[in-house]
Amino acid sequence: TSHLVKCAEKEKTFCVNGGECFMVKDLSNPSRYLCKCQPGFTGARCTENVPMKVQNQEKAEELYQK
């Protein structure tokens, strides 16, 4: 089984644009990293800009779910 832990200080730069870094701890596989991106960014390392249209759509969906 695997679980997520927050990255150590020295690993945080795996993600860019202020993305929050998590390490996937898995006993049977090497460690790998995931990023939770800031609003406006996407991609494996938060390098991609989300088009404004999509951002607005996401906000609308978020409000609807609330």
Epitope: K12, T13, V16, R45
Partner: antibody, heavy 116, light 107 residues
Framework: EVQLVESGGGLVQPGGSLRLSCAAS????????IHWVRQAPGKGLEWVAA????????NYADSVKGRFTISADTSKNTAYLQMNSLRAEDTAVYYC?????????WGQGTLVTVSS | DIQMTQSPSSLSASVGDRVTITCRAS??????LAWYQQKPGKAPKLLIY???SLESGVPSRFSGSGSGTDFTLTISSLQPEDFATYYC?????????FGQGTKVEIK
């Protein structure tokens, strides 16, 4: 042992094209982030482009956007930089580098000279 | 783009000296700051990343500090092999940008 070997540099006329290669070994290529950085003669370092081989996402410096294309072939563990519409100011040593938490491994560089 | 400004642009020092190089970012880069060493005709070599993390295999005389916009690279006791050019680089946001370099020369 991690190794990055660039090739494809040379002399080209303004407006011409070149394709640089970066052959990688010693690590999981598809799981990394590959960058190209250049250095004009006697000058500092300039970031050029990056690619995530796993999903093909790319990023470019404004100075090369629309002229340069970065790509990767995971079956060959090789990244490429296709350079079109070359200008005199593109003259530089071009390095490829891997990025885990910073640019940790670099190739030896390949010289591109744009001159008539 | 984030501008990176290094100082000094060059310095002369003797073996055994303590050397400090500073780097300032034009906007907040948190702790996403790396330092590289480059010798003539060679590729840059990573020394420090995430502002203060020492890259594997790099001697402990090298250290980094800072966060936000102001950063420092310190060489506690300069060795003959340390004479080189040093670059800072922000790796907080693309495009990644480098300082103009600091050349450390023999006095």
């Amino acid at each position: 042992e991690v190794q990055l070997v660039e090739s494809g540099g040379g002399l080209v006329q303004p407006g011409g094209s070149l394709r640089l290669s970066c052959a990688a070994s010693g690590f999981t290529f598809s799981g990394t982030w590959i960058h190209w950085v250049r250095q004009a003669p006697g000058k500092g370092l300039e970031w050029v482009a990056a690619i995530t081989p796993a999903d093909g996402s790319t990023n470019y410096a404004d100075s090369v956007k629309g002229r340069f294309t970065i790509s990767a072939d995971t079956s060959k563990n090789t990244a490429y930089l296709q350079m079109n519409s070359l200008r005199a100011e593109d003259t530089a040593v071009y390095y490829c580098a891997t990025y885990m938490f910073a640019m940790d491994y670099w190739g030896q560089g390949t010289l591109v000279t744009v001159s008539s | 783009d984030i501008q990176m400004t290094q100082s000094p642009s060059s310095l002369s020092a003797s073996v055994g000296d303590r050397v400090t190089i500073t780097c300032r970012a034009s906007q907040n880069v948190d702790r996403s700051l790396a330092w590289y060493q480059q010798k003539p005709g060679k590729a840059p070599k990573l020394l420090i990343y995430a502002a203060s993390s020492l890259e594997s295999g790099v001697p402990s005389r090298f250290s980094g500090s800072g966060s936000g916009t102001d950063f420092t690279l310190t060489i506690s006791s300069l060795q003959p092999e340390d004479f080189a050019t040093y670059y800072c680089q922000q790796h907080y946001t693309l495009p990644f940008t480098f300082g103009q370099g600091t050349k450390v020369e023999i006095k």
